[in-house]
């Protein structure tokens, strides 16, 4: 019996035309939502003038339906048993699942001012930037609508730069009508224990963002894992959102719509400083902001973002060192709300439910030559927003799963 089931599973999780896995893999049957909470800055003037703590108040959720588009350019390679594809991006606003509209206004850090002052460190260039910032009446903070902040707006300061620069700014710009990839993953035909594991991303086995093992593209994309998952396993996966591979460890058994699943979570150790977790040494890319690599819980992904000083963390700086959150008032981290988890059906390796949580932050530093940053006395890693991307297997699919997979085993 068990062997027959194993054989069936092995056959059905292969990523090729005609299998259950392939059908759900090409276009997810699960509705995936991305909820955003924006950190509205309450005291912009006091911060700019006196270098006060930044008081933030989160506003949300603002919900979008995402990952509803089928994978594109799906191409099998029989020679190396891989399948390559592009994952198109799309987001549809869901007013009924949101606290307001895309036209809601927020006071947030001026992304262009913070980024330009970081990218251009030369003092003379900063003086040029300063004159353009003043001319455009830009400041350290700005008021932007949700739509502008997420999907892009024409920045008045950058529009004055007299040489070619991208003048459109947005945390996820460009998004709609773009695609992530190309991914090339093993289809499992020759070796089921490699199914869905990424062979190359954008044609490479490494990212070129990090040193040493940190630069590796490990595991799957977290939508599924090779079958027959054990509780003792460390599940590696790659997330292009955070420009790195990461891992999850078993936390508990969960019953999801009658299906026994394993809950795997991202442990705090994954976000630890190299002092606590020496493996993380290569995620520490500079010594000043990281206080000689002793800070933890924030990841500098500027190399992956054309030099813009973007830092990724968990929401509300969960698992981050006190020095990171000290200059920010109004944060309340808690594991239940702010950690990331994957609920994996162990026989198939399919992720049947997940909650991916992350926070987007921007570094802003004092600048002698930029008037609106001149009074700052310290560096700030400023939270802009946090997101919760969730998906749960639908009732119909769960019934099918119970009858065809778990029911047959039990």
């Amino acid at each position: 019996g068990d062997l027959l089931i194993q054989k069936t599973i092995k056959k059905q999780v292969v990523l090729e035309e005609g299998t259950i896995a392939f059908k759900n893999w090409v276009k997810t049957g699960t509705e995936v939502y991305r909820q955003f909470w924006i950190f509205d800055v309450q005291n912009p003037q006091e911060v700019m003038m006196n270098s006060s703590n930044i008081q933030v108040k989160q506003r949300g959720p603002y919900t979008y339906r995402v990952r509803f588009l089928a994978k594109e350019n799906v191409t099998q390679d029989a020679e190396d048993n891989t399948v390559s594809f592009l994952q198109p991006n799309g987001a549809i606003f869901e007013p009924s699942l949101s606290v307001g509209t895309e036209a809601d206004n927020f006071t947030v850090l001026n992304l262009a001012v913070a980024a330009a002052s970081h990218i251009y460190q030369n003092q003379f260039v900063q003086m040029i930037l300063n004159s353009l910032i003043n001319k455009s009446k830009s400041s350290m903070f700005q008021v932007r609508t949700l739509r502008e902040l997420l999907w892009g707006y024409r920045d008045p300061f950058l529009s004055l730069v007299p040489y070619p620069v991208t003048t459109t700014v947005g945390l996820f710009y460009p998004y709609n009508n773009t695609a992530d990839g190309v991914y090339k993953v093993f289809n499992g035909k020759d070796n089921i224990s490699k199914v869905a594991i990424i062979d190359t991303y954008k044609g490479k086995r490494n990212l070129s963002y990090w040193e040493s093992h940190c630069d590796m593209i490990n595991g799957t994309d977290a939508a599924s894992f090779p079958p027959f998952v054990e509780k003792s396993q460390v599940l590696q996966f790659f997330s292009s959102d955070i420009c790195r591979s990461i891992y999850a460890v078993f936390e508990s058994d969960v019953n999801l719509k009658g299906i026994p699943v394993y809950r795997f979570v991202l442990p705090s150790k994954a976000f630890a400083s190299p002092v606590e977790n020496p493996d993380n040494y290569c995620f520490c890319t500079e010594k000043i902001i990281s206080k000689n690599c002793t800070s933890y819980g924030v990841l500098d992904i500027s190399k992956c973002k054309e030099g813009r000083p973007v830092y990724i963390s968990l929401p509300h700086f969960l698992y981050a060192s006190p020095d990171v959150s000290e200059p920010i008032d109004g944060l309340n981290p808690n594991e239940e709300e702010h950690r990331t988890y994957l609920d994996i059906e162990p026989i198939t390796g399919f992720t049947l439910q997940f909650a991916k949580r992350l926070q987007v932050n921007l570094l802003v530093k004092p600048s002698e030559k930029i008037q609106v940053l001149k009074n700052l006395k310290r560096n700030y890693i400023v939270p802009i927003l946090w997101l919760n991307e969730t998906g749960t297997i639908g009732d119909e699919k769960a019934n099918m799963f119970r009858s065809q997979v778990t029911g047959k085993i039990n």
Partner: antibody, heavy 115, light 107 residues
């Protein structure tokens, strides 16, 4: 050692243009911006503008906006200042000088505008 | 635009004297003031850069002080070779602006 060597003296007719060169050596050219300063006979110093060879960032003094063009050629470590629509008041010694604090100067180029 | 008012325009001193030159700016420029010496037929020479930093090789009898809008340049124990024009330059904001210059004559 750091050296800035400028092109030779020029005599120009009113309405014409002049292009002064400044060849840098002894440091990595794109590491520092190049500023241009002029000094009319018996007068003080006047900043004209500056260019950062690395980014191409340029700033001009309002007075010269539209008449002066600064360029930098990283391959030859040379900066150029071109001044157009010359008038007699443009008769001056033109200096290139490095960085915001003007730490090294060229020897100067005398431009005489005369009909 | 930050205007820089330098005074005096002319001063005369005897070797061994102490002289001071003043530069006042129309806006707060922190400590971004630089001081130069220029002798006839030569380009200016940087003596003191932002933050009252004496340049390598410049004699210690030259010094400066000031912050915000008021700046002072001092030469202690003047020597005959100090006869020259002296200029201040603010490098806090664009356009960069010079003082009008001070001619120092040694009797």
């Amino acid at each position: 050692q750091v050296q800035l060597v400028q092109s030779g003296a020029e005599v120009k007719k009113p309405g014409s243009s002049v292009k002064v060169s400044c060849k840098a050596s002894g440091y990595r050219f794109s590491d520092y911006e190049m500023q241009w300063v002029r000094q009319a006979p018996g007068q003080g110093l006047e900043w004209m503008g500056g260019i950062d060879p690395e980014t191409g960032g340029i700033a001009y003094a309002q007075k010269f906006q539209g008449r002066v063009t600064l360029t930098a050629d990283k391959s030859t470590s040379t900066a150029y200042m071109e001044l157009s629509s010359l008038r007699s008041e443009d008769t001056a010694v033109y200096y290139c000088t490095r960085k915001l604090d003007f730490d090294y100067w060229g020897q100067g180029t005398l431009v005489t505008v005369s009909s | 635009e930050t205007t820089v008012t330098q005074s005096p325009a002319f001063m005369s001193a005897t070797p061994g004297d102490k002289v001071t030159i003043s530069c006042i700016t129309s806006t707060d420029i922190d400590d971004d003031m630089n001081w130069y010496q220029q002798k006839p037929g030569e380009p200016p020479k940087l003596l003191i850069s932002e933050g009252s930093t004496l340049r390598p090789g410049v004699p210690s009898r030259f010094s400066s002080s000031g912050y915000g809008t008021d700046f002072t340049f001092t030469i202690n124990n003047i020597e005959s070779e100090d006869a020259a024009y002296y200029y201040c330059l603010q490098s806090d904001n664009l356009p960069l602006t010079f003082g009008q210059g001070t001619k120092l004559e040694i009797k």
